[in-house]
């Protein structure tokens, strides 16, 4: 990987940025798990679902998200109306018609149905972070990234480059 | 207006050191991974280094590793590359680069600076 | 580490005419659903520009006659139709694993 980026410090919010084209460049099914290798699964309760994150028993089967990429412009910090390059989206499906959102109130990840096109919360910048790691930083508020608290997604502040290599940011994609 | 401007080539002897230093604008540099690239005169491109965001993880390919040092300075907007037990193979233009936010392609390049290795 | 061997070395064509590049890795950069396979254009006396980024994706600014396609091993950039200002080298890149390598790159000369 090329390592990691650092925080987005622009006062120019990440929703500023563009997306590209309406449909996804690409799509990829994946299992996501934690850096210590905890599964992400989610489940049905009360017509609504829930978010895990836990170990696995031996042999028992990952839950699969569907990745969609988008690119997207990046909005320049500097020049008002300049644009600063591109970066790599995604929206996280683990079911049909449900999207992984962040709800920055809350500070909570949360998965809602919703119809095309998605609302900005659904979008996330992914960093290609080192030991084949991803990250996943808020559209909607740069600087926050999906992470792990009490064995839940949450939103997680990141507040300086050197705290993005922080464990419970990093993220693991894996076909199988 | 996004801009790298390379400085500290210039002719060396075999088995000198030699510092070059990348002054970026026009971005916030703490947020991007920076790297060098390298090109041998009428030769191709090759990466030489590779620095993290929040200076965490630096690479190197294994043909300077232990000889050559990237570091940065986010106070200052600048990357350098520390190179030392400098071989006639490593004369080329080092150009600085800047990734994507993100970090997954070089997206921004320097003019380069010229490095001459020789007796 | 990943080779990436580029076809042909030496492209001759006139300005209107089609250009197809061809960059072939020794194995697949493919991660995470993604072609991490770059192509950037270099002009005598100036540095590498980006040209595509995962394989097909334009890079800020870049026209609409470049495009880029494949996927696995096998990738190329087309020139739908050649303007003056085309006549350079392009390489392909490679993003998936350190140590990052290009090809060696194919000349578009006027012929």
């Known amino acids: 990987a090329f390592g990691i980026s650092g925080v987005q410090k622009y006062t120019r919010a990440l929703h500023d940025s563009s997306i590209t084209g309406i449909s996804p460049i690409t799509e990829y099914l994946a299992s996501l798990s934690t850096y210590n290798d905890q599964s992400i699964t989610f489940a049905l309760e009360d017509e609504s679902y829930e978010i895990y994150v836990e170990d696995l028993k031996k042999d028992e089967k990952k839950d699969k998200v569907l990745l969609s990429y988008y690119e997207s412009q990046h909005p320049s910090n500097e020049s008002g109306d300049g644009v600063d390059g591109k970066m790599l989206m995604v929206t996280l499906s683990p079911t049909k018609d449900f999207w992984l959102h962040a709800n920055n109130k809350e500070h909570s990840v949360e998965l809602h149905k919703c119809e095309k096109p998605l609302p900005d919360q659904a979008f996330f910048v992914l960093h290609n972070m080192h030991s084949n790691c991803v990250s996943f930083e808020c559209k909607t508020d740069p600087g926050v990234f999906i992470g792990v608290k009490d064995n839940h997604l949450a939103l997680i502040k990141v507040d300086s480059s050197e705290n993005l290599c922080t464990e419970n940011i990093l993220f693991k994609l894996s076909e199988t | 207006e996004v801009q790298l401007v390379e400085s500290g080539g210039g002719l060396v002897k075999p088995g000198g050191s030699l510092r070059l230093s990348c002054a970026a604008s026009?971005?916030?540099?703490?947020?991007?991974?920076m790297s060098w690239v390298r090109q041998a005169p009428g030769k191709g491109l090759e990466w030489v280094a590779t620095?993290?965001?929040?200076?965490?993880?630096?690479d190197y390919v294994d043909s300077v590793k232990g000889r050559f040092t990237i570091s940065r300075d986010d106070a200052k907007n600048s990357l350098y590359l520390q190179m030392n037990s400098l071989r006639a193979e490593d004369t080329a233009v080092y150009y600085c680069?800047?990734?994507?936010?993100?970090?997954?392609?070089?997206?921004?390049w320097g003019q380069g600076t010229l490095v001459t290795v020789s007796s | 580490e990943i080779v990436l061997t580029q076809s042909p070395a030496t492209l001759s064509l006139s300005p209107g005419e089609r250009a197809t590049l061809s960059c072939r890795a020794s194995?697949?950069?493919?991660?995470?659903?993604?072609?991490?396979l770059n192509w950037f254009q270099q002009k005598p006396g100036q540095p590498p520009r980006l040209l595509i980024f995962?394989?097909?994706n334009r890079g800020s600014g870049i026209p609409a006659r470049f495009s880029g396609s494949g996927s696995g091993t096998d990738f190329t950039l087309t020139i739908s139709s050649l303007e003056p200002e085309d006549f350079a080298v392009y390489y392909c890149?490679?993003?998936?694993?350190?140590?990052?390598?290009f090809g060696q790159g194919t000349k578009v000369e006027i012929k």
């Open positions: 680069t800047r990734a994507n936010y993100g970090d997954w392609f070089f997206e921004v």
């Open positions: 026009g971005f916030t540099f703490s947020s991007f991974s």
């Open positions: 620095i993290s965001g929040g200076k965490t993880f630096t």
């Open positions: 194995e697949s950069v493919a991660k995470y659903g993604l072609s991490l």
């Open positions: 995962a394989a097909s």
């Open positions: 890149q490679q993003s998936k694993e350190v140590p990052f390598t």
